[in-house]
């Protein structure tokens, strides 16, 4: 799996999970989230050569085609596979609210 | 929806469905498929600016982050959303076989 266990321990130019910390105020301009200040969102990046973690039959076809016609830019792309939620604390007036924001943290990647 | 009805009729540099014909023998080296000779596989391509058909909360966060930090290369990517199968005819010896190959045709796209 193209997850932290594999990707963070290997030098990998191909599609893999990459670490990324997001600071809500600095990076997104979101001032409404009280806690946490930021979080490890991670992201997916890297090349998708033939058979590298292909998600579907179409992505396998596309990566094979791309070896012949790279100028078409018709290659699969490295995107998130498994995502996890993030629990946040915010206020409505003086009332604290705890909420789970779904699909906020990328745990693994795929070529799609 | 970023499908043929929208994408093929508009000038759209952002993430959208693009037409692409794949010839099995010429483009993939697959000589085992007897019919069809090829098919309209399509593919997804284009930029994923903030809120352009974002798939998840993470892709929205990432596209917003990317507007502030474009040099980070941490942007969402334009990938397939809905896929359809393709029916093919091939031979085992002299016996014709009809089979459905799943997820062969892209019908719409998303930023993920």
């Amino acid at each position: 799996a193209l997850d932290a266990a594999y990707c963070f321990r290997n030098v990998q130019d191909n599609c893999c999970l990459r670490p990324l910390y997001i600071d809500f105020k600095r990076d997104l301009g979101w001032k409404w989230i009280h806690e946490p200040k930021g979080y490890n969102a991670n992201f997916c990046a890297g090349a998708c050569p033939y058979l590298w973690s292909s998600d579907t039959q179409h992505s396998r076809v596309l990566s094979l085609y791309n070896t012949i016609n790279p100028e078409a830019s018709a290659s699969p792309c490295c995107v998130s596979q498994d995502l996890e939620p993030l629990t946040i604390l915010y206020y409505i007036g003086k009332t604290p609210k705890i909420e789970q924001l779904s699909n906020m943290i990328v745990k693994s990647c795929k070529c799609s | 929806a970023l499908d043929a009805a929208y994408c093929f009729r508009n000038v759209q540099d952002n993430c959208c469905l693009r037409p692409l014909y794949i010839d099995f023998k010429r483009d993939l080296g697959w000589k085992w498929i007897h019919e069809p000779k090829g098919y309209n596989a399509n593919f997804c391509a284009g930029a994923c600016p903030y809120l352009w058909s974002s798939d998840t909360q993470h892709s929205r966060v990432l596209s917003l982050y990317n507007t502030i930090n474009p040099e980070a290369s941490a942007s969402p990517c334009c990938v397939s959303q809905d896929l359809e199968p393709l029916t093919i005819l091939y031979y085992i010896g002299k016996t014709p076989k009809i089979e459905q190959l799943s997820n062969m045709i892209v019908k719409s796209c998303k930023c993920s």
Epitope: A72 | C7, N10, R18, L20, D27, K37, N40
Partner: antibody, heavy 119, light 107 residues
Framework: QVQLKESGPGLVQPSQTLSLTCTVS????????VHWVRQPPGKGLEWMGL???????RYNSALKSRLSISKDTSKSQVFLRMNSLQTEDTATYYC?????????????WGPGTMVTVSS | DIQMTQSPASLSASLGETVTIECLAS??????LAWYQQKPGKSPQLLIY???SLQDGVPSRFSGSESGPQYSLEINSLQSEDAVTYFC?????????FGSGTKLEIK
């Protein structure tokens, strides 16, 4: 309906650069590929190169060092630039569209523009 | 590059006759062949693609066939407007190449 139309100078000096424009209507350059094909007077057709719907290019290796194809999708225009022109580059230059990218035959052509290379 | 050898260079036939123009590919092009008609001073018009598929709007008297590396364009019941030049084109591999053309005349 689908239309393509080439425009550019009718006469170019030897060693100079040729610049041609193909203006299209009835289809989008973000959907279809556009090719350039030329035909010397009384002779056959030569495929020069193409620009993909995604903006990538592919050139005939015989012309690659001299040729550049680009586009402005918002203006529905494709551009051809070829440098170091010689008299043998005298030809009618056509732009053409393939019906589906990667089909590689041409269902619509422009009327062509005649280019003479002469001093 | 794939060479397309087209024959004959010129051809004369009577109205109503059937004529055949041939193209020989220097290597296997897997039926990736198109035929075009070109009238004097005009751009080529697509007749046939994928060796035998008739382009929309093209009269059914035009047909394409293949036998190994040899590809043929057949024109049945020849009409006066058919007396123009015909080209084949391989759409199998870069660079896409054309035959040298066949000029068809009416006797």
């Amino acid at each position: 309906q689908v239309q393509l139309k080439e425009s550019g100078p009718g006469l170019v000096q030897p060693s100079q650069t040729l610049s041609l424009t193909c203006t299209v209507s009835g289809f989008s350059l973000t959907t279809y590929n556009v090719h350039w094909v030329r035909q010397p007077p009384g002779k056959g057709l030569e495929w020069m190169g193409l620009i993909w719907n995604t903006g990538g290019t592919r050139y005939n290796s015989a012309l690659k060092s001299r040729l550049s194809i680009s586009k402005d999708t918002s203006k529905s225009q494709v551009f051809l630039r070829m440098n170091s022109l010689q008299t043998e580059d005298t030809a009618t230059y056509y732009c053409a569209r393939d019906p589906v990218p990667n089909k590689w035959h041409f269902d619509f052509w422009g009327p062509g523009t005649m280019v003479t290379v002469s001093s | 590059d794939i060479q397309m050898t087209q024959s004959p260079a010129s051809l004369s036939a009577s109205l109503g006759e059937t004529v055949t123009i041939e193209c020989l590919a220097s290597e296997d092009i897997y039926s990736n062949l198109a035929w075009y008609q070109q009238k004097p001073g005009k751009s080529p018009q697509l007749l046939i693609y994928d060796a035998r598929s008739l382009q929309d709007g093209v009269p059914s008297r035009f047909s394409g066939s293949e036998s190994g590396p040899q590809y043929s364009l057949e024109i049945n019941s020849l009409q006066s407007e058919d007396a123009v030049t015909y080209f084949c084109q391989q759409h199998h591999a870069y660079p896409f190449t054309f035959g040298s053309g066949t000029k068809l005349e009416i006797k």
